[in-house]
């Protein structure tokens, strides 16, 4: 297991919510991504492929999420001070082998200006 701080902007604030960006290498074909708050699993997304190369995407702990070819974004809404915590992206790589787990994270600071929905011009 590889642990570390995210070397990219992990938190993107908008309209009283936050997009938490969990990146993975482009070469990764099949994986599970979990979003942890402290040690608790908040959200997860699993991408696998069958023998006909058909993609299956599953969530056991569902959050609004968005998948791209090198990241999973999890969205948290209605931010309040209780959201301030360490968040971790727990990536389990199934394919290509070997199986590997990486953990990257950062601290989500909540400021007053991020709590209310702001108009964007």
């Amino acid at each position: 297991e590889i642990n570390g701080s995210a070397n990219y902007e992990m938190f993107i604030f908008h309209n009283g919510g936050v997009q938490i960006l969990c990146k993975y290498p482009d070469i990764v074909q099949q994986f599970k991504m979990q979003l942890l708050k402290g040690g608790q699993i908040l959200c997860d997304l699993t991408k696998t492929k069958g023998s006909g190369n058909t993609v299956s995407i599953k969530s056991l702990k569902f959050c609004h999420s968005q998948l791209s070819n090198n990241s999973v974004s999890f969205f948290l809404y209605n931010l309040d001070h209780s959201h301030a915590n360490y968040y971790f992206c727990n990536l389990s790589i199934f394919d290509p082998p070997p199986f590997k787990v990486t953990l990257t994270g950062g601290y989500l600071h909540i400021y007053e200006s991020q709590l209310c929905c702001q108009l964007k011009f």
Epitope: T48, K49, S51, G52, N53, T54, D95
Partner: antibody, heavy 117, light 111 residues
Framework: EVQLVESGGGLVKPGGSLKLSCAAS????????MDWVRQAPGKGLEWVGN????????EYSPFVKGRFTISRDNVKNTLYLQMNSVKSEDTATYYC??????????WGQGTLVTVSS | DIVMTQSPSSLAVSAGDRVTINCKSS??????????LTWYQQKTGQAPKLLIF???TRHTGVPDRFMGSGSGTDFTLTINSFQTEDLGDYYC?????????FGPGTKLELR
């Protein structure tokens, strides 16, 4: 240790039905796509179809589509193949296989289905 | 559907031989940096076993005398220093798209 054990094979008349089962153990069944592959006596391997982890996606060979149905029970750790309107060309050993992300990495011992009047 | 062909269909071999089995697909199996091609071994009366995936990666526990190579549409399985326990049928298989298909097989027999 991964184990797949097929059952339910036997003699069936053309146009008849048969249901095969595959009991899985030694791994988290609900984490894997599963497939059926068949082999006619003295012939090569032929893919029958597959099912994703929770049963929401199924795919079939054009040779069996509309006649065969694959399902699974993740509580019982069992894979099924419902064979309807069988033909003589369906005579084969049917293997239950685990799709291990990039290949069929575990196979059952197979169960023989004979279609004959 | 992608058609897989294999040559030769059968081959007589002796212990210590270097054995080469060829597999050709009707369209490229390369996607990104991966060739979606696997090789299986089937001994008489047994279920098949996975040998090679992604054209060249040996599956866990497979002896290093088995080597896969090739890219695109042309692939090769090589057995360096054939052993008698390697007797059986060998199948290539693609999982580039649905339906995945197998080659017709190559039978290795003792000379």
């Amino acid at each position: 240790e991964v184990q797949l054990v097929e059952s339910g094979g036997g003699l069936v008349k053309p146009g008849g039905s048969l249901k095969l089962s595959c009991a899985a153990s030694g791994f988290t069944f609900s984490d894997y796509w599963m497939d059926w592959v068949r082999q006619a006596p003295g012939k090569g391997l032929e893919w029958v179809g597959n099912i994703d982890e929770d049963g929401s996606i199924t795919e079939y060979s054009p040779f069996v589509k509309g006649r065969f149905t694959i399902s699974r029970d993740n509580v019982k750790n069992t894979l099924y193949l419902q064979m309807n309107s069988v033909k003589s060309e369906d005579t084969a050993t049917y293997y239950c296989t685990r799709w291990g992300r990039f290949g069929f990495d575990s196979w059952g011992q197979g169960t023989l289905v004979t279609v004959s009047s | 559907d992608i058609v897989m062909t294999q040559s030769p269909s059968s081959l007589a071999v002796s212990a210590g031989d270097r054995v080469t089995i060829n597999c050709k697909s009707s369209q490229s199996l390369l996607s990104g940096s991966f060739n979606y091609l696997t090789w299986y071994q089937q001994k008489t009366g047994q279920a098949p076993k996975l040998l090679i995936f992604y054209a060249s990666t040996r599956h866990t526990g497979v002896p290093d005398r088995f080597m896969g190579s090739g890219s695109g549409t042309d692939f090769t399985l090589t057995i360096n220093s054939f052993q008698t326990e390697d007797l059986g049928d060998y199948y290539c298989h693609h999982h580039y798209n649905a339906p995945p298909t197998f080659g017709p097989g190559t039978k290795l027999e003792l000379r």
